[in-house]
């Protein structure tokens, strides 16, 4: 772990660099100076599968080093290498309290492994409070509850998902840091399987207690679009999904689990370069509303509905989708006002088993991933050791060990 680059900054940590980038990083942002940007000069940075593609601010010469994009659930800001804020976003793990830094020795010595880690705080991901995450050697964090063979498919935070093999070099480590307000995973000097001659990659993902997600890239020795995805997916961005259970056509008495990805942010891989960074700031979601009045008066871009039975505000597209359907929330909310719920007892309801999980809007706005019918996209194994067995509490050189594979 090397010290933070860009030493010599006089600015305090966390200051917001509203900027266009490079030397322009000190200038006013285009969005703050409306006359700078004309519609034809806009280009697409990333895809938002939840709501189509979105325009983002660029300058006419298309060289903007700071790019902002609104993705419904998050606003992303991309900071280029010369934008000073990209240095600020890098967390210097080497300077952190050693008791809060752990080298994951198993992940640091293996290939295609993943390990469960418990956070010290609830991290809001797409509005859902998460306390456990799964770190993968392949440059991503799996955010799902249910471990399966398709960790790379959805429910991820991926600063740079690719076929990294930390076992290749003694210098490669997967380190994480938790100080109670931020959880940082750093893939340090990791090499791409089969592309070791290109050099090592060092990057990190930071999960902040307020829901912000930061990808910071220190060393990216090659063009990311050139990275082969034949052996492992190559992705940069966020994704979330919900699971629903529906009767299996083969075995009527059993229920088949289907994963539906309801939202994804894909960053342009060509923007991932050394000393760049991306910051995702969460936008309000329906789930944050705790009362019917707040829910129904919400002016979010989402169509929020109140489910009296569950005492939950939702758009119907979140991880609680199954409950939303089982309790007939979609129908319950239709045409009803908050006053209509005043006299109802919300504790007595039971799931409506006759309600079909396949209501119309699901198929038109979600991409579905059927776990049991897809070809295996990834063979990342779950490491059962989430505790001390796989960890080093300090930054001393790692020791090689025999990986324990758990078939998933």
């Amino acid at each position: 772990l090397s010290p933070q680059p860009g030493a010599g900054h006089d600015e305090g940590p966390g200051s917001g660099w509203a900027a266009k980038g490079t030397v322009r990083g000190w200038n006013r942002r285009a969005r703050e100076s409306p006359g700078h940007v004309s519609e034809p000069d806009r280009t697409q940075l990333s895809q938002d599968l939840g709501g189509g593609t979105l325009a983002m601010d660029t300058l006419p010469d298309n060289r903007t080093r700071v790019v902002e994009d609104n993705h419904s659930y998050y606003v992303s800001r991309l900071y280029g290498p010369s934008e000073p804020h990209s240095r600020e976003l890098w967390v210097d793990v080497a300077e952190a309290n050693r008791s809060q830094v752990k080298i994951h020795t198993i992940l640091s010595n293996t290939h295609r492994q993943a390990s469960r880690v418990v956070l010290s705080f609830d991290f809001p991901f797409y509005g859902h409070p998460l306390r456990q995450i799964t770190i993968a050697t392949g440059g991503f964090i799996f955010m799902g509850d249910v471990i399966h063979r398709m960790l790379t498919a959805t429910q991820y935070v991926a600063p740079l998902m690719a076929n990294f093999n930390p076992g290749y070099s003694d210098n490669s480590t997967v380190v994480y840091f938790d100080n109670g307000t931020v959880f940082v995973v750093q893939w340090d000097h990791v090499y791409l399987q089969g592309w070791e001659d290109k050099g090592s990659f060092t990057f990190q993902a930071a999960l902040h207690h307020d829901g912000r997600i930061v990808f910071a890239y220190k060393e990216i020795p090659m063009s990311v679009p050139e990275i082969s995805s034949s052996q492992h997916p190559v992705k940069t961005g966020l994704s979330d999904a919900f699971m629903i259970l529906n009767p299996s056509p083969d075995v009527p008495e059993s229920r088949r689990r289907s994963i539906f990805e309801y939202h994804r942010i894909e960053l342009d891989p060509s923007k991932v370069t050394s000393m760049s960074a991306v910051e995702f700031t969460p936008l309000p979601t329906c789930l944050q509303h705790r009362s019917c009045d707040a829910c129904m008066s919400s002016d979010l871009t989402f169509n929020c509905s109140w489910c009296h039975v569950l005492q939950r505000c939702s758009s119907g597209f979140d991880r609680y989708r199954q409950e939303w359907m089982d309790y007939g929330c979609a129908q319950e909310a239709e045409g009803r006002m908050c006053e209509d719920f005043q006299d109802e007892d919300h504790d007595s309801a039971s799931p409506d088993t006759s309600f079909s999980p396949y209501d119309g809007d699901l198929t038109t706005t979600s991409s579905s991933l059927f776990i049991d019918s897809l070809t295996t996209e990834d063979d990342t194994k779950l490491n059962p050791y989430a505790g001390g067995d796989g960890l080093q509490n300090n930054l001393s050189p790692k020791t090689k060990g025999t990986p324990v594979h758990l078939g998933t």
Partner: antibody
Framework: QVQLVESGGGVVQPGRSLRLSCAAS????????MHWVRQAPGKGLEWVAV????????YYADSVKGRFTISRDNSKNTLYLQMNSLRAEDTAVYYC???????????WGQGTLVTVSS | DIQMTQSPSSLSASVGDRVTITCRAS??????LNWYQQKPGKAPKLLIY???SLQSGVPSRFSGSGSGTDFTLTISSLQPEDFATYYC?????????FGQGTKVEIK
């Protein structure tokens, strides 16, 4: 037209202070990060400091850190460089420059000479 | 800090010649490289930004190329007004360092 005009240079003794000014015109000064660059006699260009468009963030070259302070007054369209504890090696022509929207410094002043000598 | 090294430090050429100046960064700087021209007693003038983009008003005989650590400024056909000192500068990260300069003189 777009213009930057420096002033405030002169001869000063080592250890003393001097304040340079740079008056901007012809563009929206408050939209641009501004820089100071210096050039010692017969030598090359040396970047000195930058201040962000709104004046809240600065960065300095190691050679001047702790001695020089860059500031700006957007209401007066003026950039400043307060130079304290001056040394002989600070002798140079000081240029103010505008950070381009493309990249680099696209507008420069004519320069003002600072001579530090006893 | 990122060091910028120009070569040659000086060169002699004739009007009409093709002139090439190189600049090397001590670490990779992507395409965050600018070129300036300076004449005696005058302020520098931005010629090329982002390694290869021609600044508005600059003659097309000036061109820039390169990425990573190695960059080149080319003057395709040297004109009398091109005799000057040329500087490269990195804008990858502050401090925004300059090369030591290349003086183009009349042969």
């Amino acid at each position: 037209q777009v213009q930057l005009v420096e002033s405030g240079g002169g001869v000063v003794q080592p250890g003393r202070s001097l304040r340079l000014s740079c008056a901007a015109s012809g563009f929206i000064f408050s939209d641009y990060g501004m820089h100071w660059v210096r050039q010692a006699p017969g030598k090359g260009l040396e970047w000195v400091a930058v201040i962000s468009y709104e004046g809240s963030r600065e960065y300095y070259a190691d050679s001047v850190k702790g001695r020089f302070t860059i500031s700006r007054d957007n209401s007066k369209n003026t950039l400043y460089l307060q130079m304290n504890s001056l040394r002989a090696e600070d002798t140079a022509v000081y240029y103010c420059a505008r950070g381009s929207e493309g990249d680099g410094f696209d507008v420069w002043g004519q320069g003002t000479l600072v001579t530090v000598s006893s | 800090d990122i060091q910028m090294t120009q070569s040659p430090s000086s060169l002699s050429a004739s009007v009409g010649d093709r002139v090439t100046i190189t600049c090397r960064a001590s670490q990779t700087i992507s395409n965050y490289l600018n070129w300036y021209q300076q004449k005696p007693g005058k302020a520098p003038k931005l010629l090329i930004y982002a390694a290869s983009s021609l600044q508005s008003g600059v003659p097309s005989r000036f061109s820039g190329s390169g990425s990573g650590t190695d960059f080149t400024l080319t003057i395709s056909s040297l004109q009398p007004e091109d005799f000057a000192t040329y500087y490269c500068q990195q804008s990858y990260s502050p401090p925004y360092t300059f090369g030591q300069g290349t003086k183009v003189e009349i042969k």
